[in-house]
């Protein structure tokens, strides 16, 4: 399987909400012995390998934000901890998983990574990640809503944040 990032760049005004999205592609084993561990974290540019460094998102670690479930289940992070930090990660039945960040500030700008680990008994794992950039802008040059730039082409799409 692979992880696709529909958008490689999100440009948002300060104070807005944004949902960063990843999608699981290809054959996904839904067998009883398979578990999926999905998480989000921040990383930094200029590495040899993108997403190899795992930094917290608003002080929440990859383990605080992880989703853990079988191949056929939807899941959400622990609401209390994440929501206190204006965050929520979620996963649906169709391979989409996302992290929603509320009330963006300039400090939220940076590289974000989604990671999926397919885990089988006994403890064998297969890791795949995706990366996207979030730019939070302020002032007269900031867009009124988030603008997203698709990974495959440079056509931009205006979206109204929820």
């Amino acid at each position: 399987f692979k992880v696709a990032t529909p958008y490689s760049l999100y440009v948002c005004p300060e104070g807005q909400n944004v949902t960063l999205t990843c999608r699981l592609l290809g054959p996904v084993d839904k067998g009883h012995d398979v578990t999926f561990y999905k998480t989000w974290y921040r990383s930094s540019r200029g590495e040899v390998q993108t997403c190899s460094e795992r930094r917290p998102i608003r002080n929440l670690t990859f383990q605080d934000l992880h989703l853990h479930h079988g191949g056929h289940q939807a899941a959400n992070t622990s609401h209390d901890l994440a929501q206190r930090h204006g965050l929520e990660s979620a996963s649906d039945h169709h391979g989409n998983f996302s992290i929603t960040m509320r009330n963006l500030t300039l400090l939220d700008s940076g590289l974000y990574c989604c990671l999926v680990v397919e885990i089988r008994h006994h403890h064998s794992e297969h890791r795949v990640h995706g990366a996207m950039e979030l730019q939070v802008q302020t002032g007269k040059d900031a867009p009124s809503n988030c603008v997203v730039y698709p990974s495959s082409s440079q056509d931009s799409e205006n979206i109204t944040a929820a």
Partner: antibody
Framework: DVQLQESGPDLVKPSQSLSLTCTVT?????????WHWIRQFPGNKLEWMGD???????NYNPSLKSRISITRDTSKNQFFLQLNSVTTEDTATYYC?????????????WGAGTTVTVSS | DIVLTQSPASLAVSLGQRATISCKAS??????????MNWYQQKPGQPPKLLIY???NLESGIPARFSGSGSGRDFTLNIHPVEEEDAATYYC?????????FGGGTKLEIK
Amino acid sequence: DVQLQESGPDLVKPSQSLSLTCTVTGYSITGGYNWHWIRQFPGNKLEWMGDIHKSGSTNYNPSLKSRISITRDTSKNQFFLQLNSVTTEDTATYYCARDYYGFSWYFDVWGAGTTVTVSS
Amino acid sequence: DIVLTQSPASLAVSLGQRATISCKASQSVDYDGDSYMNWYQQKPGQPPKLLIYGASNLESGIPARFSGSGSGRDFTLNIHPVEEEDAATYYCQQSIEDPWTFGGGTKLEIK
């Protein structure tokens, strides 16, 4: 909160079988990763014995493979340890535990442990 | 089996000072940039309690005076500043290869 509790006999005779139960509350044994048995000998040495996966498949320490069996009862949310042909060397405190994943595998929840003495 | 050798076997540290415990593996416990090494604390009559996973990640609810470092074969648990309640035995554990194994333990006494 996830809680694990071991139960079984305190005393087992040599050559007999040791049977222990781990009762899990607050979490389904079919929803997590793996459920383990670990023992600690009188000198405090810890030994991983084996585990049962949420799917029911098992994995054992090769040093015990000929004597050990781990099974489960999903309706009661329990898993079991059977160790055959015990000797005095099997005297130990037996723990059940759950493992978890976070770019390492680790035991995040343990039972309080039950001490089993093998003696005639 | 991967053998984990802890040192020292015991140590006594004054209140407020630093305790350093070493764990050396007989082979690398790294995979894809991560170290499959964990640290536990055990007090008499209690089960081991997870402190650090993946060599350096602090388990939720564990005080920040505990920290872990290392990669490959060499790992360290640091406690600073040491408090009275830290008197316990500390174990390292690897999960890179079956069978999972534990170190022999380090007993920490507070002076």
